[in-house]
């Protein structure tokens, strides 16, 4: 229904809690350099405008849309132009152009420190002196840095922050409360932001059919029971959904998400036996709660899936009669028979079914065509599962760190000319998949691994569109998002790479490594195994296990030496020398 | 939506010839194959013939072949059937279908062949 005021409506529905946190989201994830006190004024003057609105709706200015009222309140930033250069030519344009244009300005590589959590002690101090302030920086400093994070899941994530402050401050030992808890919040928030991107980037490169394709396979893996109708209901709600968030229309998001769970718990008869748990929390929890439950159990007596889609003599009928709807069908029929697959191998079995169904639908004889579409399906089922069983192996055998370091190998002799820096961090995200995904049932680990790298990779590719240097990259990310796993997969040495000159200082390592956060010296034992492999891309596992141990004995003498700098700067060159040795 | 029309039946003598007609609309016309089916007075539905998208591949019945031809013209969005050299067994509602359906939608278009 339409609403004589927009933000007025989205003042009374959201609360006001909840419309300034999203209101503050918004602006840091458009102007991603502004301070959080630049912010947060403006989010002041916003909120109490929603007010007088919600007093008067035919105040003046009250008619005006959200991204009318958001736009003109960022476009009156002073030195918008000293601070953001081309973003400013933004507010040249009039709604809707406006708004796109600030779109595409966010970075999803903002050149802003890496997030410092301050030490328990100060964290507890300004927590109790004022924990709105407190938990509008964190938002803050998320969003600005996750620009595509998925607003109201944002406020969940800033509401486990409140409770596990509440709950350690109180405690004698703040830090050993603190520490974990808040590791375990950031390590999920992470995941919920690369995860996000991808379905933005799914949303704006492939428009909402391809998103709703998604949904409609996710959905029906974890609601089996669920029939047809259902599900598209579902799919085409949460696609409505993620499209506001990603196009920064974060309050009609978090207002339709809300209204989504509302339906599913209402509903929970049609939908799925698994919801209760869920429903009986308040509206973040809840949220979240759905948007994670658990598969509820797949129907005991389900027909083989070839009955309506191989050996029905009405298949091309049908598929003539409504393309979408058949696929959708045929998806959902998929999908919710094999809880056990990813999205993505699903995706990529609906598209062999729909190529298939193109081709033999216009032969002579169509059934004796797709007759065989099934067992060609096979080998694209083989490859997700050879991947499983070959990188969770070598997880257990190597270990996190060890098994980011053979991803770090392998991506760096794929892509040798994507920078150091973006090699190191794929690799390490990519080699949590391990920690994440390996130590689950059997029939999980597919859907955890496929699903997360894509994700993962999906970040790559937006990195390396910013600045492409690797025509393997530009090729595995131009094509659909389905296949880009795959294409990563199968990429072998770049032949093309013309090896990196051998720098000493590359390698030339200070004392004041010994005193690094393990993460960090890690990160640096990384970038020197980047560097070599980028020398030597030829490198045999062999030779640069040889190197590594002696880099890593190396650093272990020097830290533990009385005289550090001297260590050093005297064996330093002898590692360099020994490197070079190894390596020719 | 999908919409068939079958024209061009009629009552003709044996060893006579019809010309069948399918106007095709609500799909796109030249990705699909297409097939002639027929219904007897008091039988089940045969095939009769079967064409590809392109019309470059045609499929017929035992019964019919040497006699029918099958052929189609995707800028009309039009499926034929030349039926010649017509038979008493020939009497039947004829169908056309998308693909290799044997389960028409349509109205038919009714063939009967008496001296």
């Known amino acids: 229904e339409a609403h004589k005021s927009e933000i007025a409506h989205r003042y009374n529905d959201l609360g006001e809690q909840h419309f300034k946190g999203l209101v503050l989201i918004a602006f840091s994830q458009y102007l991603q350099k502004c301070s959080y006190d630049e912010h947060a004024k403006l989010v002041q003057e916003v909120t109490d405008f929603a007010k007088t609105c919600v007093a008067d709706e035919s105040a003046a200015n009250c008619d005006k849309s959200l991204h009318t009222l958001f736009g003109d309140k960022l476009c009156a930033i002073p030195n918008l132009r000293e601070n953001y250069g081309e973003l400013a030519d933004c507010c040249t344009k009039q709604e809707p152009e406006r708004n796109e244009c600030f779109l595409q300005h966010k970075d999803d590589n903002p050149s802003l420190p890496p997030f410092e959590r301050p030490e328990a002690e100060a964290m507890c101090t300004s927590f109790k002196e004022n924990p709105t302030t407190f938990m509008g920086h964190y938002l803050h400093e998320v969003a600005r840095r996750h620009p595509y994070f998925y607003a109201p899941e944002l406020l969940y994530y800033a509401e486990q922050y409140n409770e596990i402050l509440t709950q350690c401050c109180a405690e004698a030992d703040k830090e050993s409360c603190l520490t974990p808890k808040l590791d375990g919040v950031k390590e999920k928030a992470l995941v919920s932001s690369v995860r996000q991107r991808m379905k933005c980037s799914s949303m704006q490169k492939f428009g909402e059919r391809a998103f709703k394709a998604w949904a409609v396979a996710r959905l029906s893996q974890t609601f089996p029971n669920a029939d047809f109708a259902e599900i598209t209901k579902l799919a085409t709600d949460l696609t409505k959904v993620n499209k506001e968030c990603c196009h920064g229309d974060l309050l009609e998001c978090a207002d339709d998400r809300a209204e989504l769970a509302k339906y599913m718990c209402e509903n929970q008869a049609t939908i799925s036996s698994k919801l209760q748990t869920c429903c009986d929390k308040p509206l973040l929890k809840k949220a979240h709660c759905l948007s994670e439950v658990e598969h509820d159990t797949m129907p005991a007596d389900l027909p083989a899936i070839a009955a309506d889609f191989v050996e029905d003599q009405e298949v091309c009928k049908n598929y003539a009669e409504a393309k979408d709807v058949f696929l959708g069908t045929f998806l959902y029929e998929y999908s919710r028979r094999h809880p056990d697959y990813s999205v993505s191998l699903l995706l990529r079995l609906a598209k062999k079914y729909e190529a298939t169904l193109e081709k033999c639908c216009a032969e002579a004889n169509p059934p004796a065509c797709y007759g065989t579409v099934l067992a060609e399906f096979q080998p694209l089922v083989e490859e997700p599962k050879n991947l499983v069983k070959t990188n969770c192996d070598l997880y257990e055998k190597l270990g996190e760190y060890g098994f980011q370091n053979a991803i770090l190998v392998r991506y760096t002799q794929k892509a040798p000319q994507v920078s150091t820096p973006t090699l190191v961090e794929a690799a390490r995200n990519l080699g949590r998949v391990g920690t994440k995904c390996c130590t689950l049932p059997e029939d999980q680990r597919l859907p955890c691994v496929e699903d997360y790298l894509s994700a993962i990779l999906n970040r790559v590719c937006l990195l390396h569109e910013k600045t492409p240097v690797s025509e393997h990259v530009t090729k595995c990310c131009s094509g659909s998002l389905v296949e880009r796993r795959p294409c990563f997969s199968a990429l072998t040495v770049d032949e093309t790479y013309v090896p990196k000159e051998f720098k000493a200082e590359t390698f030339t390592f200070h004392s004041d490594i010994c005193t690094l956060p393990e993460k960090e010296k890690q990160i640096k034992k990384q970038t020197a195994l980047a560097e070599l492999v980028k020398h030597k891309p030829k490198a045999t596992a062999e030779q640069l296990k040889t190197v590594m141990d002696d880099f890593a004995q190396f650093l272990d003498t020097c830290c533990k030496a009385a005289d550090k700098d001297t260590c050093f700067s005297t064996e330093g060159p002898n590692l360099v020398t020994r490197c070079k040795d190894a390596l020719a | 939506k999908v919409q068939l029309v079958e024209s061009g039946g009629g009552l003709v003598q044996p060893g006579g010839s019809l010309r069948l007609s399918c106007a095709a609309s609500?799909?796109?016309?030249?990705?699909?194959?297409m097939t002639w089916v027929r219904q007897a007075p008091g039988k089940g539905l045969e095939w009769v013939s079967s064409?590809?998208?392109?019309?470059?591949?045609?499929l017929y019945a035992d019964s019919v072949r040497g006699r029918f031809t099958i052929s189609r013209d995707n800028s009309k969005n039009t499926l034929y059937l030349q039926m010649n050299s017509l038979r008493a067994e020939d009497t039947a509602v004829y169908y056309c279908?998308?693909?290799?359906?044997?389960?028409?939608s349509s109205q038919g278009t009714l063939v009967t062949v008496s001296s």
């Open positions: 279908t998308i693909g290799g359906s044997l389960s028409p």
């Open positions: 609500g799909f796109t016309f030249s990705s699909f194959g």
């Open positions: 064409i590809s998208g392109s019309g470059s591949d045609t």
